[in-house]
Amino acid sequence: DGCKDIFMKNEILSASQPFAFNCTFPPITSGEVSVTWYKNSSKIPVSKIIQSRIHQDETWILFLPMEWGDSGVYQCVIKGRDSCHRIHVNLTVFEKHWCDTSIGGLPNLSDEYKQILHLGKDDSLTCHLHFPKSCVLGPIKWYKDCNEIKGERFTVLETRLLVSNVSAEDRGNYACQAILTHSGKQYEVLNGITVSITERAGYGGSVPKIIYPKNHSIEVQLGTTLIVDCNVTDTKDNTNLRCWRVNNTLVDDYYDESKRIREGVETHVSFREHNLYTVNITFLEVKMEDYGLPFMCHAGVSTAYIILQLPAPDFR
């Protein structure tokens, strides 16, 4: 049928709560395109009737809620005037108990996120809620070890939990809970977050300067190898950590299994007044899921990102 197949990484989800996945891959979906969702190579598209438990909502597929039998490979077909892409998404539904629900704890968890707080600093955790505009979200409540978080050091601000003066005791199992309203019905979303504490990103009395990257996009072809340097100047006596992160996780940890994207070994050149540090990120093979995602270079309190972008089609 002339469609190019693109395979996404597996999504592991919890049963009994809402889930949504957006079929958007810039710049494929930036022009005039049609998006249609299918399940398990069925010829019949996913329903667009909003009353259906599983339905397509614009470019999204929406499960209200996700159920055991929903595991499988879903395809979204993106048709442009001169192109066709078929994105394959493998969804695995499982039952996960974060607290024992039989004793009045929290219900089943969705995605298990790993986030980091910096010791002694003011920092924040994020509740990742990805749903179409038709879903109204809130209010958000935060829990630690199954107890609702309260206290002067914690402030719920939109999707974040601000934590002031982070201490070692702040590590542990967190969850954010949101009420999702869709077509007059209410559902509960619960995301588990495993929080670790680091003291590595110390200020060191200096603010490092990231020379490159500069919060920009890089055009790169699908399937190619890409190496990007992060160049940082800092004082000679600094104690700052320099690293690459994606989704608030060290790239080496995030891609621990596939090792497809790795952080390089840091090198530095000494000048009289300062040091110039270089740490690179290597994409062994650029995949579709890498596009549109900010890959962040961190140097102490400084951050800068690159976003990979598909080259504009050449119609010559």
Partner: antibody, heavy 120, light 112 residues
Amino acid sequence: QVQLVQSGAEVKKPGASVKVSCKASGYTFTNYYMNWVRQAPRQGLEWMGMFHPYGDVTRLNQKFKDRVTMTRDTSTSTVYMELSSLRSEDTAVYYCARTTSMIIGGFAYWGQGTLVTVSS
Amino acid sequence: DIVMTQTPLSLSVTPGQPASISCRSSKSLLHRNAITYFYWYLQKPGQPPQLLIYQMSNLASGVPDRFSGSGSGTDFTLKISRVEAEDVGVYYCAQNLELPLTFGGGTKVEIK
């Protein structure tokens, strides 16, 4: 639709206190922070703090921490902001404001403002 | 506290012409969750402020599409593609990355 209606203008003497009210309607009162922002004559905007009716959580700009108290009356969906030990530089329009949604920031809804004049 | 610095202080624009306002923050407002916690407001004479742009580049409800927001983590721009008479007022930038929330000093836009 969301509406925030504030109390009327006040004239106060230095050293006195003022209590400004903000009555909310058109949404679930206990789901949202109420923010307070002030604007001195021909000046910019200054965030004073925010108050969450669920759990009575107050977060203040340190500049006002000893002088501002925020309270609520859930039965009337009203939030109050009291500023004590008034001085002439507290002469300003005081606004209450609510965010766009529970997960998107930015103050999409504002009260009409309450002018507080501090003069001896 | 994060300091927000706006330029220019005032701007006089011919109707139908484009206009641009800049704002710089003393700290990057790009959070590691990839959201930029930056906002633009317009305060028309005698009115409370109104939200124009949220999270750096998203148009608030009811705002005409002649307004657009862009920027990096620290440098931001509000563009009006074709200024209309109703666009006069004081434009403020703001951040809510962290407490206290802070605003820029404002840019007054008037019609020539």
